[in-house]
Interface confidence: low
C-alpha cells in the first residue's frame, strides 16, 4: 500500500520507498551481515523504513541491496533520487584503510518481475555516489538528520521494467529514501489547444513534437504543436485553435456566448451584443433572432441590425398625356433602417363601371426607365389604351420586403387616359342582299379609345373604283343601303368616330346585288 506524497506535476513516481507502509522487503546479499532494514524516525518524528550498513572495520566489503521490480510505464529515461546519510570516516576511530565514503548504484533491465536472486554480472553501473555532506553522531542525538540527496538518470530503457541495486564497499550508510521517477510534460492548454501528458524523450537533449487537440467548442486555425523538453517543460508553442461560432475564450476555455450575445464565426473575437432589433435567448448563439416585424436579408452580416420593410412612398402625383402617364412620388417616411430601397410599378387596367374589377396591364405597356427596381422616384408609362381607367401602384421595397407576410408599403393612383381616334373595324358583313339593297352589320372596334359617336359607311360601284362614292352615317352597328342597281358589284367600307376623330376604314367588303326578286342571306366578308 502506497501513501501519497506531493511531487512536481512533471514527475511521475514509479517507486517511493517512503510511501510504502510496512516492510520494504528488498533482497540483500549476503542475507545477513550486510544491508539491514531498520525503522528510524524522520525529521517529523514519523517512522520510516531505511536500509543501513556500517561494516567499516572489515576490509573487502561487497554488500548488495536490490529493489523489487520497477515497471517503466513507457518511460525511456528514468531518474533515481537517493536520500541518504554517510558517516564521516574521520569520526570513526581505528578504521583507516577499511572505511569508505562512497557506494555504487546499478540497474538491470528485465521483463521478469519475479527474479529472486542478485546476479551481480547482470547489473550495469550507473554511478559511484559520494556524500556532499557527512554527519557525525552528535547530529543524530539532536534529532537532526543531515541528509544527502543525489539524483542520477539512466536510459534509454526498452524492457518492461528494471531493478536497482546498491553496492556497499565498506561505508557507514543509511538509505533513507529511494525514489524512482520519470519526467513528463503535464497535460496543458495553450492557445486553446490541449496537449496530453507526454513522456519526455530518451536522451537529455531530445525534444518530442506533440500535436495538440482543440479544446471543446473550438477548431484548428493552424495545426497546434508544442515540443516536450527533456526536463518536462513545454517549449515553442506553434499554431492555435479558435473558439467556434457561438463561443468565446474565457479562462482558457471556449465558453458559450451569454444570453443576449452571439458570435457568428470561428474567430478569436469575443461574443458581441445582439445588434439592434434582435435578441438571443439561448447560450451559444451564432446569430441573433430578429424582433417581431424585423428581418435580416440573406446577404446581411450577422452583425447588422435587423431591419424592416419601408413604409409606403408619399405624395404620388400623376400627369396624363393622351395614352401616356408620368408618375412622380416622394421617398417613404421610414426606410426600415436600410439603404437598398427601390420602387416597383404595378399597372392595372380597370373597368369603368366597377373599379374593383382590375386586370394586369400586360406586356404591351412600356415603362421608362423601367418597371421594377427603380432607383429614381419617377416613371413614364406609355402605350396605354385611350379612354381607359388605370390604377398604378408604386411599391417601396428593400432587402427585407420579401420576408414581410403582410405588405402594405404601396401608394396608388387611378387615372383615365384621354380619348383618341378609334381603331379600324375588323369585321363587316352583308346580312341580307336583294336586287336594290344590302343590309350591313359590323363589330365595334377592338380599341374604341373613347365613346363611339357614329359610324360612317362609304360605298361605290366596283367598276367606278372610288371615283364616285356615297356616304351613309349611323349610330348603330348596322344599316340598310338602298337604291342600288341590280346585278351590280358594290364595295363597302366602314369606320368609327369618337370625339377625337375618325378611325381608319375597314377592309373593303364586295357585294353583288341580285337579278331575281328573291333574297340571298349572307354572313361572310364577301357576298356574291
Amino acid at each position: 500500500v502506497t501513501g501519497s506524497r506531493v511531487y512536481p506535476a512533471n514527475e511521475v513516481t514509479l517507486l517511493d520507498s517512503r510511501s510504502v507502509q510496512g516492510e520494504l522487503g528488498w533482497i540483500a546479499s549476503p542475507l545477513e551481515g550486510g544491508w539491514e532494514e531498520v525503522s528510524i524516525m524522520d525529521e517529523k518524528n514519523t517512522p520510516i523504513r531505511t536500509y543501513q550498513v556500517c561494516n567499516v572495520m572489515e576490509p573487502s566489503q561487497n554488500n548488495w541491496l536490490r529493489t523489487d521490480w520497477i515497471t517503466r510505464e513507457g518511460a525511456q529515461r528514468v531518474y533515481i533520487e537517493i536520500k541518504f546519510t554517510l558517516r564521516d570516516c574521520n569520526s570513526l576511530p581505528g578504521v583507516m584503510g577499511t572505511c569508505k565514503e562512497t557506494f555504487n548504484l546499478y540497474y538491470y533491465e528485465s521483463d521478469n518481475d519475479k527474479e529472486r536472486f542478485i546476479r551481480e554480472n547482470q547489473f550495469v553501473k550507473i554511478d559511484t555516489i559520494a556524500a556532499d555532506e557527512s554527519f557525525t553522531q552528535v547530529d543524530i542525538g539532536d534529532r537532526i538528520m543531515k541528509l544527502n540527496t543525489e539524483i542520477r538518470d539512466v536510459g534509454p530503457l526498452s524492457k518492461k521494467g528494471f531493478y536497482l541495486a546498491f553496492q556497499d564497499v565498506g561505508a557507514c550508510i543509511a538509505l533513507v529514501s529511494v525514489r524512482v521517477f520519470y519526467k513528463k510534460c503535464p497535460l496543458t492548454v495553450r492557445n486553446l489547444a490541449q496537449f496530453p501528458d507526454t513522456i519526455t524523450g530518451a536522451d537529455t537533449s531530445s525534444l518530442v513534437e506533440v500535436r495538440g487537440s482543440c479544446v471543446n467548442n473550438s477548431e484548428e486555425k493552424d495545426v497546434p504543436k508544442m515540443y516536450c523538453g527533456a526536463d518536462g517543460e513545454w517549449l515553442v508553442p506553434i499554431g492555435n485553435c479558435l473558439c467556434n461560432a457561438g463561443h468565446e475564450e474565457r479562462s482558457g476555455e471556449c465558453q458559450a456566448c451569454k444570453i443576449g450575445y452571439y458570435k457568428a464565426l470561428s474567430t478569436d473575437a469575443t461574443c458581441a451584443k445582439c445588434p439592434p432589433h434582435s435578441y438571443s435567448v439561448w447560450e451559444g448563439a451564432t446569430s441573433c433572432t430578429c424582433d417581431r416585424g424585423f428581418f435580416r436579408a440573406d446577404n446581411d452580416a450577422a452583425s447588422m441590425p435587423c431591419t424592416r420593410p419601408p413604409s409606403a412612398p408619399l405624395n404620388l402625383i400623376s400627369n396624363v398625356n393622351e395614352t401616356s402617364v408620368n408618375l412622380e412620388w416622394s421617398s417613404p417616411q421610414n426606410t426600415g433602417g436600410r439603404q437598398d430601397i427601390s420602387y416597383n410599378v404595378v399597372c392595372k387596367k380597370c373597368g369603368a363601371g366597377d373599379p374593383s374589377k382590375c386586370r394586369p396591364c400586360g406586356s404591351g405597356v412600356h415603362y421608362t426607365p423601367q418597371q421594377n427596381g427603380l432607383k429614381t422616384t419617377k416613371v413614364s408609362i406609355t402605350d396605354l389604351l385611350a379612354h381607359t381607367n388605370y390604377t398604378f401602384e408604386i411599391w417601396a421595397v428593400n432587402g427585407v420586403s420579401k420576408y414581410n407576410p403582410n405588405p402594405d408599403q404601396s401608394v396608388s393612383v387611378t387615372v383615365t387616359t384621354n380619348q383618341a381616334a378609334p381603331s379600324s373595324i375588323a369585321l363587316v358583313q352583308a346580312k341580307e342582299v336583294t336586287r336594290y339593297s344590302v343590309a350591313l352589320a359590323w363589330l365595334e372596334p377592338d380599341r374604341p379609345n373613347g365613346v363611339i359617336l357614329e359610324y360612317e359607311v362609304k360605298y361605290y360601284e366596283k367598276d367606278q373604283n372610288e371615283r364616285s362614292y356615297r356616304i351613309v352615317r349611323t349610330a348603330a352597328r348596322n344599316t340598310d343601303i338602298k337604291g342600288l342597281n341590280p346585278l351590280t358589284s358594290y364595295v363597302f367600307h366602314v369606320r368609327a368616330r369618337t370625339a377625337a376623330g375618325y378611325g381608319d376604314f375597314s377592309e373593303p367588303l364586295e357585294v353583288t346585288t341580285n337579278t331575281v326578286p328573291s333574297r340571298i342571306i349572307g354572313d361572310g366578308a364577301n357576298s356574291t
Epitope: I259, Y279, T289, D291, R292
Partner: antibody
Framework: QVQLVQSGSELKKPGASVKVSCKAS????????MHWVRQAPGQGLKWMGW????????TYAQGFTGRFVFSLDTSVSTAYLQISSLKAEDTAVYYC?????????????????WGQGTTVTVSS | DIQMTQSPSSLSASVGDRVTITCRAS??????LAWYQQKPGKAPQLLLY???NLADGVPSRFSGSGSGTDYTLTISSLQPEDFATYYC?????????FGQGTKVEIK
C-alpha cells in the same frame, strides 16, 4: 379561451412505446414554443426540453436524449411526446407547457399555460 | 447546470398567517425566475414571473422579491385555497431547472 388539452392516461409494459399528444387552441400555435415537463410520483418537476413550433426543431435536456422524441402536426395545432423502450422509471405525469417564441416587450420567460397532464404508468 | 434550492421543504401554517418561501440559485440568474403553485392531481399554475411580476388573475396577497441568487415568495395572509406545493424555476441558460418544492400544509 387559451388551453392545452393532453391525451388520456396510459398503462404500458416495459419495452413498449407511448405517444402523448398536446392539442393547443385559442391562440396561434406557431407563435409559442412547446415544452415538456416530467413529474415522477411524489417528486418535483423536471424540464425535458422543447420544440420550435415554427421550424419543428427539437431541443432535449440532458437525460432525455435517445428514447424521447418531440414532434408536431401544425395542421391540427398539436405537439407530441413519444417515449420508446419504456422503463419503470418513466412512470410519471407528463405536462406540456407553452412559452412565446418571440419577445413582445417583456424579456422574461415563463410557462403561462400548462396542459392538464398525462399519466404514463410502466408496469409488467 | 444551475441548481435551485428551495427552503423549507414543507411548512405548517394557519389561515391568516404570513408565509415566506425562499429559493436560492447556484449562480446569478438575473431575476429570470418564475413561481408556480401546484395542487394534488393538477398541473402547476403560474403565480409570478421575472421574480416580482404577478401573473394575470393571481391574488395580490402573493408577492415576490429578490435578485442575484436569492429569491422569496411571500403570501401575506394565507387563505384555505393556498394550501398546495410551490415551485420556483429559473430561466437563465438551459436546462431550466425547478426547485424541489415547498409543501404548505394546514397546522
Amino acid at each position: 379561451q387559451v388551453q392545452l388539452v393532453q391525451s388520456g392516461s396510459e398503462l404500458k409494459k416495459p419495452g413498449a412505446s407511448v405517444k402523448v399528444s398536446c392539442k393547443a387552441s385559442g391562440y396561434t400555435f406557431t407563435d409559442y414554443s412547446m415544452h415538456w415537463v416530467r413529474q415522477a410520483p411524489g417528486q418535483g418537476l423536471k424540464w425535458m426540453g422543447w420544440i420550435n413550433t415554427e421550424t419543428g426543431e427539437p431541443t432535449y435536456a440532458q437525460g432525455f436524449t435517445g428514447r424521447f422524441v418531440f414532434s408536431l402536426d401544425t395542421s391540427v395545432s398539436t405537439a407530441y411526446l413519444q417515449i420508446s423502450s419504456l422503463k419503470a422509471e418513466d412512470t410519471a405525469v407528463y405536462y406540456c407547457a407553452r412559452i412565446p417564441l418571440y419577445y413582445y416587450g417583456s424579456r422574461y420567460w415563463y410557462f403561462d399555460v400548462w396542459g392538464q397532464g398525462t399519466t404514463v404508468t410502466v408496469s409488467s | 447546470d444551475i441548481q435551485m434550492t428551495q427552503s423549507p421543504s414543507s411548512l405548517s401554517a394557519s389561515v391568516g398567517d404570513r408565509v415566506t418561501i425562499t429559493c436560492r440559485a447556484s449562480e446569478n440568474i438575473y431575476r429570470n425566475l418564475a413561481w408556480y403553485q401546484q395542487k394534488p392531481g393538477k398541473a402547476p399554475q403560474l403565480l409570478l414571473y421575472a421574480a416580482t411580476n404577478l401573473a394575470d388573475g393571481v391574488p395580490s396577497r402573493f408577492s415576490g422579491s429578490g435578485s442575484g441568487t436569492d429569491y422569496t415568495l411571500t403570501i401575506s395572509s394565507l387563505q384555505p385555497e393556498d394550501f398546495a406545493t410551490y415551485y420556483c424555476q429559473h430561466f437563465w441558460g438551459t436546462p431550466w431547472t425547478f426547485g424541489q418544492g415547498t409543501k404548505v400544509e394546514i397546522k
